[in-house]
């Protein structure tokens, strides 16, 4: 494995990021900030790329299947969380198929830096971003019900995953901004019924003296629908995002409101609080078999079933979140560490003091993970990430649970020959799971002066496709040294987040 020039592999990095985004089933598109490191290895007629990519979440859902650079800037009237990440990626290309870049595996860590960047000085509002988004499922359900009243074609959609929740508080009232995915759950499952997904943005406004979230005085919701088989927006109507800082009451209200939680509602105080399904296994104990690399684009839409799929978390990126508000004490709708107060003025990403143990103010003063410059989380896994589940677009998610006669394996995705699946801690052998390639781990929000812990690099071995010795693993351990001509330059427009990335890697 030899170091290579970061700028020389830019086309591969950009394409790899597009493939990663297209593999993901929840969250927001990653946009490339810079190539932090690059190595390559040549095996016969195949080039293996080992890339480290610094990324930032956009405001476009991965369900949109857009190319990462085609995501428009968000509506500036709506608070937008700043989430950065770093991905270690292994990709391959055959010399005779120059367009055929394949992503073999990837590990990403992500973290919100909104609180750390927030500046609330003289701000008339406090903005909090909640890590514990599940708390607001009820609001999402109410908003979707309202949307259904006005859009008959949405009658069979259900809320899938609550992706982001922001709160804006001030003297004029309180607004909750809830982003969530939905999926079509038709009553009758026809064998080839397309599994349609959507993404909704709901803005709920509450009177300044409201005591609960049940009856917003104003509710605005807009949804887009995506057909995974076409990878296109099938309703063609750009979402209209409402006016987040307008407290008027023209719209019918139908949503709830969370009380004030300390700003730091990101759950930071419980940095290792397990997700509802229990803590994820460590990244190096993935319970997935490794199927062959998928061709570019989303994986085939095979009927996948997996016992953990009933909870709407489809996708590899489910991260267990911690709310990190930055703001005020009220942010606590999620038990966050309300600590630090990170007031963040009106800046769209500002957070206020998270009164919730959030980090925003990390009121508790210490970053839950410290810096871990070597990329290993002290606990051996990223406590906030959800282990990648075997979810695909055909998951059941919020719809009916899979029939009992279906096992835990994907049809058609056994482990590669000779590869036994690694078992999770304390578990005996189980049937092979389908392996959704790649993982994204969400860490608690970063505070000023902290850097994003590096993702794990302990990828399982894989045989190269079309290789003479398919049983022989061909990938080398992920390089730990940094290429001399790296990192590359940050793309313009993202200078404020550069401080959260390590500039050198452990030797």
């Amino acid at each position: 494995v030899s170091p290579t020039d970061c700028s020389a592999v830019e086309p591969e990095a950009e394409k790899a990021l597009d493939l990663i985004n297209k593999r993901r089933r929840d969250g927001y598109l990653f946009q490339l900030l810079r190539i932090a490191d690059a190595h390559l290895d040549r095996v016969e007629n195949t080039t293996v790329y080992y890339l480290v990519l610094d990324v930032q979440e956009s405001d476009c859902s991965v369900l949109s299947r857009k190319y990462w650079n085609d995501c428009e800037p968000p509506d500036s009237r709506r608070p937008s969380e700043i989430v950065i990440g770093q991905c270690k990626v292994i990709a391959t290309r055959h010399s005779h198929e120059s367009q055929d870049l394949r992503v073999i595996d990837f590990n990403c860590t992500t973290s919100s830096v909104s609180s750390a960047l927030a500046n609330t000085k003289d701000s008339p509002v406090l903005i909090d971003f909640f890590e514990d988004t599940e708390r607001y499922r009820k609001q999402a359900n109410k908003a979707l019900e309202k949307y259904k009243e006005e859009n008959d074609d949405f009658a069979s959609f259900r809320v899938d995953r609550i992706e982001r929740v922001a709160r804006v508080r001030g003297g004029e009232g309180t607004g909750y901004f809830v982003d969530f995915s939905v999926r079509n759950c038709p009553r009758h499952h026809f064998p080839r019924h397309p599994n349609v997904f959507g993404f909704c943005r709901a803005d709920l406004f509450y009177d300044v003296e409201a005591l609960d979230l049940e009856s917003p005085k104003n509710l605005v919701i807009n949804c887009e629908v995506f057909d995974p088989q076409e990878h296109e927006n099938i309703n063609g109507v750009p979402p209209h995002l409402g006016h987040p800082f307008h407290w008027g009451g023209h719209e019918r209200s139908s949503t709830t409101k969370p009380p004030f939680k300390p700003h730091g509602s990101r759950d930071h105080h419980h940095p290792h609080k397990p997700h509802e399904h229990g803590p994820p296994p460590p990244p190096d104990e993935r319970d997935h078999s490794h199927g062959p690399p998928l061709p570019q684009g989303p994986p085939p839409l095979l009927p996948m079933s997996c016992s953990s799929c009933q909870h709407a978390t489809f996708g590899t990126n489910g991260a267990q979140r911690h709310s990190h508000n930055n703001n005020s004490s009220d942010l606590h709708p999620h038990k966050h560490h309300s600590h630090e107060q990170h007031p963040h003025g009106h800046h769209p990403h500002a957070h206020h003091p998270h009164e919730h143990d959030t980090h925003r103010q990390h009121p508790h003063g210490h970053h839950p993970h410290g810096h871990h410059p070597h990329g290993h989380h002290p606990h051996g896994h990223h406590p906030h990430g959800h282990h990648p589940h075997c979810h695909d677009f055909q998951d059941y998610g919020p719809c009916d649970p899979p029939p009992h006669n279906q096992g835990h394996c994907c049809h058609g995705h056994g482990p590669p020959p000779g590869h036994l699946r690694r078992r999770g801690p304390g578990k005996g052998p189980r049937p092979f799971h389908c392996r959704q390639i790649g993982s994204v781990y969400r860490l608690p929000p970063l505070r000023k002066g902290e850097v994003l812990p590096l993702p794990e690099a302990n990828f399982p071995s894989f045989p190269l496709p079309h290789h003479k010795h398919p049983l022989k693993p061909d990938n080398q351990p992920f390089p730990q040294s940094v290429s001399e001509s790296c990192p590359g330059k940050f793309k313009s427009g993202f200078p404020q987040v550069s401080m959260f990335f390590t500039h050198t890697f452990p030797k």
């Epitope: 406090l126 607001y136 003297g171 300044v208 005591l211 979230l213 700003h263 709708p333 007031p343 003025g345």
Partner: antibody
Framework: QVILKESGPGILQPSQTLSLTCSFS??????????VSWIRQPSGKGLEWLAH???????HYNPSLKSRLTISKDTSRNQVFLRITSVDTADTATYYC????????????WGQGTLVTVSA | DVQMNQSHKFMSTSVGDRVSITCKAS??????VAWYQQKPGQSPKILIY???IRHTGVPDRFTGSGSGTDYTLTISSVQAEDLTLYYC?????????FGGGTKLEIK
């Protein structure tokens, strides 16, 4: 109409555990967004926030007392509880429960308070 | 923790006077400040929140102002029933903290 009412033991001895109950009406802790705090006031002194519990059981504590405090709720009975372990005379105070708002932890509704005296 | 300092424990005034009670936060609390009035033997009563928003039912002689770290409660024309204790509170971040109180007395 929102009403909150605190009750407690009145008098207890140092090292004992203080158990307080806030009974309320006019709102429900099963309603999303609702949260109740405990605040105390030693006689002739200022107010000190102790703990807060939200509808979804999210809890926040004053770090200076966190190791001794436990807040909990019984949603069906419309009650919030506070336990303070290992009390001493400095814990003598009037204890209030108060309802916060969605927009922030400022408190428009308070109980009338219950006086707790810690005395040997 | 954010400390809230009410530098005057007592302030003397006369009925009909205009009086201003001040509160200083140890850091910028972005207008997340409330004011309470407490009469002897009673629980505190909210007057102002978000620095300047008067709570429902509070007489309009009470006004709040301020930003950053400095906040003021002003009573434009003091009435006899206003001669009591006033507290500020920051609702910016936990732990939510109160000032030490200012007692308004008759001159």
């Amino acid at each position: 109409q929102v009403i909150l009412k605190e009750s407690g033991p009145g008098i207890l001895q140092p090292s004992q555990t203080l158990s307080l109950t806030c009974s309320f009406s006019g709102f429900s802790l099963s309603t999303s967004g609702v949260g109740v705090s405990w605040i105390r006031q030693p006689s002739g002194k200022g107010l000190e926030w102790l703990a807060h519990i939200y509808w979804d059981d999210d809890k926040h504590y004053n770090p200076s007392l966190k190791s001794r405090l436990t807040i909990s709720k019984d949603t069906s009975r419309n009650q919030v509880f506070l336990r303070i372990t290992s009390v001493d005379t400095a814990d003598t105070a009037t204890y209030y429960c108060a309802l916060g708002t969605v927009g922030g932890p400022w408190f428009p509704y308070w109980g009338q308070g219950t006086l707790v005296t810690v005395s040997a | 923790d954010v400390q809230m300092n009410q530098s005057h424990k007592f302030m003397s005034t006369s009925v009909g006077d205009r009086v201003s009670i001040t509160c200083k936060a140890s850091q910028d609390v972005s207008t997340a400040v409330a004011w309470y009035q407490q009469k002897p033997g009673q629980s505190p009563k909210i007057l102002i929140y978000w620095a300047s928003i008067r709570h429902t039912g509070v007489p309009d002689r009470f006004t709040g102002s301020g930003s950053g770290t400095d906040y003021t409660l002003t009573i434009s024309s003091v009435q006899a029933e206003d001669l009591t204790l006033y507290y500020c509170q920051q609702h910016y971040s936990t732990p939510w903290t109160f000032g030490g109180g200012t007692k308004l007395e008759i001159k």
